[in-house]
Amino acid sequence: ERLCHPCPWEWTFFQGNCYFMSNSQRNWHDSITACQEVGAQLVVIKSAEEQNFLQLQSSRSNRFTWMGLSDLNHEGTWQWVDGSPLLPSFKQYWNKGEPNNVGEEDCAEFSGNGWNDDKCNLAKFWICKKSAASCSG
């Protein structure tokens, strides 16, 4: 009997997408490359449900984890790696006092129960996202 696996081995399925939580650490730009190399994207968050799921994964493992969000192009203007501007409704997820841009902090990470901005050249864990395979057939 052939079973359908919507996600590759060691990836996690959630609401039609597959997520890879890294076990090694890279800087933000290298995390983008790592995701591209496996046909995915450094995670872009599209809903409150997805945010809650990812925040839980990150906080459970007690890891600082890169997401695909930065203000590298224009200070204070946060943009996802797919080009979409950060919706104001998502700003509630920043930890208290963040983003604070202390010492050129231009990349966003999961930190504790929310988001933090940190220096992009720091090595952290990362999360990749890609669409799940269709199991119809």
Epitope: Q41, T77, Q79, W80, V81, G83, P85, P88, K91
Partner: antibody, heavy 119, light 107 residues
């Protein structure tokens, strides 16, 4: 200058798929998102969805089950497909450029194309 | 979805008048409001975004203000070319939504 132009059949039969193309000039689809918005006759504006420079899409949940937006960067074209159409999908369909990196609003619009759903 | 209610729906005014159109949101949209002008048979044109930022080339007689759930578009001195329908739009969250429109007519 920045321009967007919608094209496609003006008449679609009920239950069929509406297919429209938006051809852009004066900017690159690798730098900007493009939205689709529609306006039924004599009514207001309704957002359908958007495709971003990185090819990811966001859709209005009201259309989610039957809409697909895609693009071809090399042809500077964005396409809209809306399946299982009914008379309620009769409208002027617009494509519009996202207004930059600071928000989800529309800074340049196409002139619109009228689509009638009728047998 | 966030509902936007514009008032009035119809407005009659004369050239030189100062007019104000209001847009009320069903929840706080934190200044993420844009305004568009549409003339019959034409596509809408962006006037203002982020509540008060005028788009390139928009005359200074157009201004926007507001916060929370209530936003206004003001035209300080109506010109003949300003008679049109005006729409507000929230870009706080998806789905992006519009007001029902305010038709500004010549008195």
């Amino acid at each position: 200058q920045v321009q967007l132009q919608e094209s496609g059949p003006g008449l679609v039969k009920p239950s069929e798929t509406l297919s429209l193309t938006c051809t852009v000039s004066g900017f690159s689809l690798t730098n900007y998102g493009v939205h689709w918005i529609r306006q039924p006759p004599g009514k207001g504006l309704e957002w359908i969805g958007v495709i971003w420079r990185g090819e990811s899409t966001d859709y209005n949940a009201a259309f989610m089950s039957r809409v697909t937006i895609s693009k071809d960067d090399s042809k500077s074209q964005v396409s809209l497909k809306l399946s299982s159409v009914t008379a309620a999908d009769t409208a002027v369909y617009y494509c519009a450029r996202n207004g930059g990196s600071s928000g989800w609003y529309f800074d340049v619009w196409g002139q619109g194309t009228t689509v009638t759903v009728s047998s | 979805d966030i509902q936007l209610t514009q008032s009035p729906s119809f407005l009659s005014a004369s050239v030189g008048d100062r007019v104000t159109i209001t847009c009320k949101a069903s929840q706080d949209v934190t200044s993420a409001v844009a305004w568009y002008q549409q003339k019959p048979g034409k596509a809408p044109k962006l006037l203002i975004y982020w509540t008060s930022t005028r788009h390139t080339g928009v005359p200074s007689r157009f201004s926007g203000s507001g916060s929370g759930t209530e936003y206004t578009l003001t035209i300080s001195s109506l010109q003949p070319e300003d008679f049109a329908t005006y729409y507000c739009q929230q870009h706080y969250t998806t789905p992006l939504t519009f007001g029902q429109g305010t038709k500004l007519e010549i008195k």
